[in-house]
Interface confidence: medium
């Protein structure tokens, strides 16, 4: 029986050229998380495997950074990044939990390039 719930950042917005953190948290279950997939519609952005660590899809490696936690950071946003993002938790023995985030990237009237930052 799947008892867990996923909390996400929900509907969020950011400006073109900026950065965003996508964050999910699985609670209310004792199931072991074996892997978390981050997907944009039907595209795989990144995988965090409990044993193997992070893998960023090659087509996103210049704009995607792992963390904080099991979250994902998107940088140098474009209007084309607008859309649904999914965190997919693979757990044992429960199975799969999915969280949804909707990101809207807005045209920036202030600055063309958003600030970047480091995740220590």
């Amino acid at each position: 029986m799947m008892t867990g719930t996923i909390e996400t950042t929900g509907n969020i917005s950011a400006e073109k050229g900026g950065s965003i953190i996508l964050q999910c948290h699985l609670s209310s279950t004792t199931a072991q998380v074996t892997q978390v997939n981050w997907e944009q519609q039907d595209q795989l952005l990144a995988i965090c495997n409990a044993d193997l660590g992070w893998h960023i899809s090659p087509s996103f490696k210049d704009r995607v950074a792992p963390g904080p936690g099991l979250g994902l950071t998107l940088q140098s946003l474009t209007v084309n990044d607008t859309g649904e993002y999914f965190c997919i938790y693979h757990t044992y023995p429960d199975g799969t939990y999915t969280g949804r985030i909707f990101l809207e990237v807005l045209e920036s009237s202030v600055a063309e390039h958003g600030a970047r930052f480091q995740i220590p």
């Epitope: 909390e7 950011a14 050229g17």
Partner: nanobody
Framework: EVQLVESGGGLVQPGGSLRLSCAAS????????MGWFRQAPGKEREWVAS???????WYADSVKGRFTISADNSKNTAYLQMNSLKPEDTAVYYC?????????WGQGTLVTVSS
């Protein structure tokens, strides 16, 4: 546009404490995420801590066990309680709401840890 106003910084001795506040206003989604970042002189801005509306928190390794992030969603305000401060914590601290942060940033609040 979201306006963010950080406050609570100041000069403190090593080992001391400070509590930073960040008040958010303006049009925003109700994502419920808030985070703190900092920028030390001559360094890149770095992520410090994050909190989700359910109270889940994440911290950079450098502050884990010393800093505590919290948020009062009814007041659209985030807090950063900083204990056992070290000279290397000296920086301008900024907050971000809903996971998005833009240029220009808010003015931030300066924290100086020095004896």
């Amino acid at each position: 546009e979201v306006q963010l106003v950080e406050s609570g910084g100041g000069l403190v001795q090593p080992g001391g404490s400070l509590r930073l506040s960040c008040a958010a206003s303006g049009n925003t989604f109700s994502g419920g995420f808030m985070g703190w970042f900092r920028q030390a002189p001559g360094k890149e801005r770095e992520w410090v801590a994050s909190v989700l509306r359910g109270g889940y928190t994440w911290y950079a390794d450098s502050v884990k066990g010393r800093f505590t992030i919290s948020a009062d969603n009814s007041k659209n305000t985030a807090y950063l309680q900083m204990n056992s401060l070290k000279p290397e914590d000296t920086a301008v601290y900024y907050c971000a709401k809903d996971g998005g942060w833009f240029d220009p940033w808010g003015q931030g609040t300066l924290v100086t840890v020095s004896s």
